[in-house]
Amino acid sequence: KAMHVAQPAVVLASSRGIASFVCEYASPGKATEVRVTVLRQADSQVTEVCAATYMMGNELTFLDDSICTGTSSGNQVNLTIQGLRAMDTGLYICKVELMYPPPYYLGIGNGTQIYVIDPEPCPDSD
């Protein structure tokens, strides 16, 4: 079953390579278990950036080596991606799945264009 997912159109990463955005889904029921996946689309290639599952009201559990962190509040997921560089600029798509209880719902956002600008190196001071 399909579900609507909303996310901001554009986000600019900080000078430290950190970008945050909210992924909001219109839950048709009372989901207790949710899976969130962030995918990056660039040059028609799609790659998985990170994925997490969480029980409603609990923190998102990403893998240990994940570049993502996040928190949830109701039907909103606050996602933060770190370690970004200019080459990581692209469309970051939020995918939400309501895993339990049945029925299973799937929603895919339109994507957030994240722009990453590498900071200029500090000039050497004499």
Partner: nanobody
């Protein structure tokens, strides 16, 4: 056109095992993910398990965790569901599904294979 064909269903006693297979045909492809869903008569469709190609990462519904194992053979374009310690509540029509890319949703579905667990 991609086709998914499930097999391996049947009638089994509670506590028994079955191994479902889902073979993809119709071209050369690399799926982002493949999964299993089930639907019991009069019930809503339920997610069972899936496996993502990227890291071979698996995910299971709590109701089957520790009893079911999903695996795939990329060379054969086949995904398997090993079901152990079956319970009467596992009785359902089991569907295989595949995603071409992570942002396309479940693009392809099989016709399903029936699993009946008697007590």
């Amino acid at each position: 056109e991609v086709q998914l064909v499930e097999s391996g269903g049947g009638l089994v006693q509670a506590g028994g095992s079955l191994r479902l297979s889902c073979a993809a045909s119709g071209g050369t492809f690399s799926f982002y993910g493949m999964g299993w869903f089930r639907q019991a008569p009069g019930k809503e469709q339920e997610f069972v398990a899936d496996i993502r190609t990227s890291a071979g990462r698996t995910y299971y519904a709590d109701s089957v965790k520790g009893r079911f194992t999903i695996s795939r053979d990329n060379a054969k374009n086949t995904v398997y569901l090993q079901m152990n310690s079956l319970k009467p509540e596992d009785t359902a029509l089991y569907y295989c599904a595949a995603e071409m890319s992570g942002i396309s949703g479940w693009d392809y579905w099989g016709q399903g294979t029936q699993v009946k667990v008697s007590s």
